[in-house]
Interface confidence: low
Amino acid sequence: IWELKKDVYVVELDWYPDAPGEMVVLTCDTPEEDGITWTLDQSSEVLGSGKTLTIQVKEFGDAGQYTCHKGGEVLSHSLLLLHKKEDGIWSTDILKDQKEPKNKTFLRCEAKNYSGRFTCWWLTTISTDLTFSVKSSRGSSDPQGVTCGAATLSAERVRGDNKEYEYSVECQEDSACPAAEESLPIEVMVDAVHKLKYENYTSSFFIRDIIKPDPPKNLQLKPLKNSRQVEVSWEYPDTWSTPHSYFSLTFCVQVQGKSKREKKDRVFTDKTSATVICRKNASISVRAQDRYYSSSWSEWASVPCS
Amino acid sequence: RAVPGGSSPAWTQCQQLSQKLCTLAWSAHPLVGHMDLREEGDEETTNDVPHIQCGDGCDPQGLRDNSQFCLQRIHQGLIFYEKLLGSDIFTGEPSLLPDSPVGQLHASLLGLSQLLQPEGHHWETQQIPSLSPSQPWQRLLLRFKILRSLQAFVAVAARVFAHGAATLSP
């Protein structure tokens, strides 16, 4: 058993056949010594008396809010949550496996630049009685600070018969060093509580591996005289690290006909302009990627040829 | 050429070669099925690798103040990786395919290190750890880890030379 936060405790249970469970001793937070009784949740049934209560926690029926009273007055509470290890594996029932980039990916994170700011998100089908708290650090043995905000519900989607909820959190490394080569990964830890079930999820990554620039901005076309060619120009996104002579991007320019089946013409360039042939009804799209490290491409920025 | 004690390197040549190194490092080891090598307990492998750290002066401001600290750090790393790529880890079984980019990568590391330090000048170099994996699968894993770590190192080096070529070239 360990303390998650004040008056909230997590009991780790091997969810096993005939497992004896965990013996837990609760102590009433009061100077009083006698006349103390204990109840669980909303029930008025007295579970025991005395300053301490010893219980055997085996299943969810044994978890909940234990309250000690004296003469009708509440003295203190202890909320017991369960963390299940089932068939040798800690339960991961609360969050959905996003399966990208590999199985058992519950948390996904992205950064728009090298400033040490990143966003993580996760999915669940649970709509009520759900809380999350997020902690993060750089490295685990001698952790350096990363500050995370509160997790918020960022999107709701309907998937078949189910509703899916996306939560996200923003974190910022306290002493980020954008130009350095990371040697210790960022660790992100999410505590999830659904009713009386506790689970924790972790992700470990280097910022360089989760970089995904915003799309290029101010995408413009300039027709070239007496030619079907156009000059496409764009700018670095505002959110990208500066100076651009140091934090450089590379770009992919694509000409795409109206039908998805039409052949796509692609040009790769380190410049912020390119000359391409503009076909009728086609569109021109540009996306960006770190020039020197193959992390994710940005989403496309697009303009119609006409 | 960067002569210890002060003069500038051939920024543009270094820029071109370091960008080529980035391309080679990624073609030698694309993200293989997103193999997460940090899960494989790699403390003893990559902790000894020279990293370009915050105090090494490789940020734009540090380069403007005195690029020598940073160039020395990059030189150290290039020599370190050049030795690793020429070691039993890459030359032993399972042998690399004949057209593997590792050979070119090895030669380019050497080329860039020589651009930074001509014959007769000696910056201190870091000792290469004695890594002699006993099993072919361990060697394969070690190669992946070294190449992943090299990708991060050469990315920073390429940024340094690109910025130098754009802002510090005579």
Epitope: D14, P17, D87, G88 | -
Partner: antibody, heavy 114, light 112 residues
């Protein structure tokens, strides 16, 4: 008294599907994962996958992905396994087993034959 | 996947003797929590498997103390003392340290 009662034997044609059931009684159905295991003609046991009856979440053995689909009906405390596009290789006894593998159903024999 | 190896047949034993059945795992089943995630089952002819031992050495409810489990993270042993006729059947070990859970091929126990 705790029990896992499986549906009876099935004789099915190649290419068809079959859905076998496992009804739990004597305990809180949603509190315990349900595993499914295959045993081909006196051979060893192969783990197919597991479902959490409370959330409906599943984990499959890669080998049985696309072959087996695990579902539950909480109202009747019943776990189901559907086997698709059956071939002779799928002829076997299939067991459900509660978390920890302490309790097993009696097994359902599936025979695939033209 | 973790591969579990078992010998197919144990030498026939006489009633009252002891016998050990071994099982080897391609990866350690010993977790950081100090527990070894291995089960032992007995499948008697025509019956469902019966859990004998879980967590390598803990006897399941109602299982005779003649059965005991031991081992390291990779080499595991089931010991049956004072063998009886009712112990005949196939003994399987199973790892539940990692998905997919895997079983050994089974060891058949015969009595002379």
């Amino acid at each position: 008294e705790f029990q896992l009662q499986q549906s009876g034997p099935e004789l099915v044609k190649p290419g068809a599907s079959v859905k076998i059931s496992c009804k739990a009684s004597g305990y809180s159905f949603t509190d315990h994962n349900m595993n499914w295991v295959k045993q081909s003609n006196g051979k060893s046991l192969e783990w197919i996958g597991v479902i959490n009856p409370n959330y409906g979440t599943t984990t499959y053995n890669q080998k049985f992905k696309g072959k087996a689909t695990l579902t539950v009906d909480q109202s009747s405390s019943t776990a189901y396994m559907q086997l698709n596009i059956l071939t002779s290789e799928d002829s076997a006894v299939y067991y459900c087993a509660r978390r920890g593998f302490a309790y097993w159903g009696q097994g359902t024999l599936v025979t695939v034959s033209a | 996947d973790i591969v579990i190896s078992q010998d197919e047949l144990s030498n026939p034993v006489t009633s009252g003797e002891s016998v050990s059945i071994s099982c080897r795992s391609s990866k350690s089943l010993l977790y950081k929590d100090g527990k070894t995630y291995l089960n032992w089952f007995l499948q008697r002819p025509g019956q469902s498997p019966q859990l004998l031992i879980y967590l390598m050495s803990t006897r399941a409810s109602g299982v005779s103390d003649r059965f005991s489990g031991s081992g390291s993270g990779t080499d595991l042993t089931l010991e049956i003392s004072r063998v009886k006729a009712e112990d005949v059947g196939v003994y399987y070990c199973q790892q539940i340290a990692e998905y997919p859970f895997t079983f050994g091929s089974g060891t058949k126990l015969e009595i002379k």
